[in-house]
């Protein structure tokens, strides 16, 4: 017997689709070897129709796929738009040839069955309503009209024109006529359930002259839509329940053995397992809404149902829509930390993944808020200005082409703790969730700026120094000027780097920035930070105020740290000043901005590109030139 297992017989009808699952033994070889689906010919040869190597035959083009689920030791063949020509014998199997391990599957596709001409078929989904049309002759106009449901022995009354209603149809069945038409009556049954399915007879009049019509009511559970998503990606359940429930509360629930457990509803209920990674969005007045879940986990796989009811809970006889979600562990989305920890006063650098094929997409960072239906207001984006309350402490660094952008948040407070989403205007599957935890700081920060009360005097020279510990010795240090469009890296002078001694003197590790001469535009937030290649690390921020020299006041004495910095600068005969005006020349260059212009300005995009390519001459000259820039206003 073959160790491969699957359905022996699959039967369907034309136009429908099938999902055939084949199970294989749990071995590493099996998980990684080629999977195939082939059709057996009269000669005994099996012709491949689709395989996991990417092969797809002409007759399956655009209507079939094969997905491997190595974590479940299964693979699935989905075939749509079936025709009778698909009827035949097939094999699903494993191996480099079609003579490997396999399982025989018989597929039969029939024509859609026809019903007797005197029976009218109504096909409705659970929770919907049906209006049954019952024609009659004029002579039966004054007679009693009725609808009954056939049982084994008799026909049980549902409703009649004398206002008799079967108890199980009270509030759900209405018998009526439209306008002046005296040749047809209608019966409307709402909130349909499985139990309503069956054969009905509508009748006008009694005895042999009565008008009768056979009705077959089919009540279907909505077929689950199959959704295949990658681990860590996101999924959107688009729910369209119809205008009749537009004003009811909406919900999404997940089926378990006995019940359907609500994950989220529009009344504020939310399953704690989905905290920080779920939103429910009413779309319009037609009863449409969507639920977005990010950061998919293996345990999110399952059977989901959306619906509407005033209670916000699943209720029999109300419209529903269903999905079967599969979470594939062979994910293209990189495994990143889902929890980032920071301390008060400190900073965090969050690496956000995006589809590397979409490097020019707009990148965003938003904060998930759970109140109401949940929402995620954007805090920063590549073309979105930083929100006012984050002034001076939030920036997004785009690293074109590397599949990651970085969001830095500093001056952390405990109120910053919460959930944040990385998203782009491109591939929505790459939305990821990060939980930021902020603990009270128990020690001094790693980066410290002096002077701390930074007030620069117009027209004079002003130096700020950023002290860093020895553990950052080998990392690249930078200063950048913050604006609500980003933090633009400035030429700087690293004084620790020039010391040739192997030992690291904790007191002398500093990177300085000099404004010479100070102009009004220099006022604002500056960041001192460390990075390694394109990986950003800690930052600290300082606000530099600029004021005019008060008449009669003496020259402001620099602090000891500044004096030390100046000595070091004089020794190297380097003026590490910057021109803010030049820096503003290209505040946010596009991906195709002139390279030379960017390099002259010391723009962050070029800085990132260079530092990510340390082996190139450009990378070398750029990083060393940061010690030798000499700008004047």
């Amino acid at each position: 017997k073959s160790p491969i297992f699957g359905p022996q017989e699959v039967s369907s009808i034309e136009g429908d689709s099938v999902s055939i699952t084949c199970y294989y033994p749990d071995t590493s070889v099996n998980r990684h070897t080629r999977k195939y689906w082939c059709r057996q010919g009269a000669s005994g040869m099996c012709t491949t129709l689709i395989s996991s190597n990417g092969y797809l035959s002409k007759e399956y083009s655009g209507r079939a796929n094969l997905i491997n689920f190595p974590e479940n030791n299964t693979f699935v063949i989905n075939i749509e738009q079936l025709t009778q020509d698909d009827t035949g014998s097939y094999k699903c199997g494993l191996g480099t040839s079609n003579r490997g391990l396999s399982f025989d599957v018989s597929l039969e596709v029939s024509q859609v069955p026809e019903l007797p001409s005197d029976t009218h078929v109504y096909t409705k989904d659970i929770g919907r309503n049906v209006t049954i049309e019952c024609p009659f002759k004029r002579e039966n106009a004054p007679s009693k009209k009725s609808l009954c449901k056939k049982t084994n022995q008799s026909c049980e009354l549902v409703i009649d024109s004398t206002e008799k209603v079967n108890p199980s149809y009270i509030g759900r069945a209405k018998l009526f006529m439209k306008g002046t038409d005296l040749t047809v009556f209608y019966v409307n049954i709402s909130h349909l359930t499985h139990n309503d399915a069956g054969l009905y007879i509508c009748q006008a009049g009694e005895g042999p002259s009565a008008d009768k019509k056979n009705v077959d009511l089919q009540v279907l559970a909505p077929e689950p839509e199959l959704l295949y998503k990658d681990l860590r990606s996101s999924v959107t359940f688009e729910c369209d329940l119809g205008r009749e429930v537009a004003n009811e509360a909406k919900y999404l629930c997940r089926m378990n053995k006995e019940t359907c457990d609500v994950i989220i509803n529009t009344l504020g209920k939310r399953d704690p397992d989905f905290e920080g990674r779920i939103l429910i969005t009413p779309k319009d007045d037609n009863g449409r809404f969507s639920v977005l879940i990010t950061g998919l986990r293996k345990e999110d796989a399952g059977h989901y149902q959306c619906g509407a009811h005033s209670s916000g809970l699943p209720q029999e006889g109300w419209p529903i829509q269903t999905w079967q979600l599969f979470v594939n562990e062979e994910s293209t989305i990189p495994n990143r930390r889902s929890v980032v920890k920071g301390v008060t006063g400190g900073s965090v650098a969050i690496a956000c993944p995006y589809n590397p094929k979409e490097s020019s997409s707009l990148k965003y960072w938003c904060r998930w808020e759970g109140d109401g239906n949940g929402h995620c207001p954007v805090l920063v984006g590549t073309q979105a200005q930083v929100q006012e309350e984050y002034e001076g402490r939030l920036a997004l660094f785009d690293q074109p082409g590397n599949g990651t952008y970085t969001v830095i948040l500093n001056q952390l407070t405990t109120e910053d703790a919460g959930f944040y989403w990385c998203l782009t205007n491109g591939d929505s599957r790459w939305r990821t969730t990060i939980e930021l935890q902020v603990a009270e700081a128990t020690r001094e920060p790693n980066l410290e700026v002096t002077p701390q009360n930074a007030t620069a005097v117009l027209g004079e020279t002003f130096t700020v120094s950023c002290h860093y510990p020895c553990k950052f010795y080998s990392q690249e240090k930078y200063w950048c000027k913050w604006s609500n469009k980003g933090c633009h890296i400035l030429p700087s002078h690293d004084e620790g780097a020039r010391q040739s001694s192997v030992s690291c003197d904790q007191s002398s590790q500093l990177v300085s920035m000099t404004l010479n001469p100070v102009s009004k535009e220099d006022e604002g937030w500056y960041w001192c930070g460390v990075k390694q290649g394109q990986t950003y690390g800690e930052t600290t921020a300082i606000y530099i105020a600029v004021e005019e020299r008060t008449r009669g006041s003496s020259h402001v004495n620099p602090t000891d740290a500044n004096a030390r910095a100046k000595v070091a600068l004089e020794e190297e005969v380097v003026d590490s000043s910057i021109s803010e005006k030049e820096n503003k020349a290209i505040p946010n260059p596009g991906p195709f901005a002139n390279e030379r212009e960017i390099q002259n300005v010391g723009d962050q995009a070029q800085e990132n590109r260079a530092s990510g390519d340390a082996g190139s001459a450009d990378g070398q000259s750029r990083s060393s030139s940061s010690k030798h820039h000499h700008h004047h206003h």
Epitope: Q8, S11, S17, V76, H194, L220, P224, M255, E316
Partner: nanobody, 130 residues
């Protein structure tokens, strides 16, 4: 509460036939899959056959030991499942249990695994005499 009731068991001679039925009942219960397992004295529960449906599509699974002899089917309403047992052998003697699933989980879960079925009947005894 969901109930599964098996019927049709009894004594049958080797080579003979028997038809088992399993009816699912319970308010609003509409199964997506139903199946048969069996358990001989002192042995583990063994998969016999299963049937799963989605709209107009039906999937039938049969265990290795009964392939070619036993077939599974269901009624149009989908609440009753049948096991047609032909060419029975003495080793088919066992208590036959009906199982049902309310949630479609075919793709990630192997129907041969008893742990993955949600509802069970009390069983019906089939004895094959030689």
């Amino acid at each position: 509460q969901v109930q599964l009731v098996e019927s049709g068991g009894g004594l049958v001679q080797t080579g003979g036939s028997l038809r088992l039925s399993c009816a699912a009942s319970g308010r609003t219960f509409s199964p997506y899959a139903m199946g048969w397992f069996r358990q001989a004295p002192g042995k583990e529960r063994e998969f016999v056959a299963a049937i799963r449906w989605s709209g107009a599509t039906t999937y039938k699974y049969v265990g290795d030991s009964v392939q070619g002899r036993f077939t599974i089917s269901r009624d149009a309403a989908g609440n009753t499942v049948y096991l047609q047992m032909n060419s029975v052998k003495p080793e088919d003697t066992a208590v036959y249990y009906c199982a049902a699933d309310r949630v479609p989980k075919d793709i990630s879960i192997d129907p041969r695994n008893p742990k993955d079925w949600d509802y069970w009947g009390k069983g019906t005894l089939v004895t094959v005499s030689s």
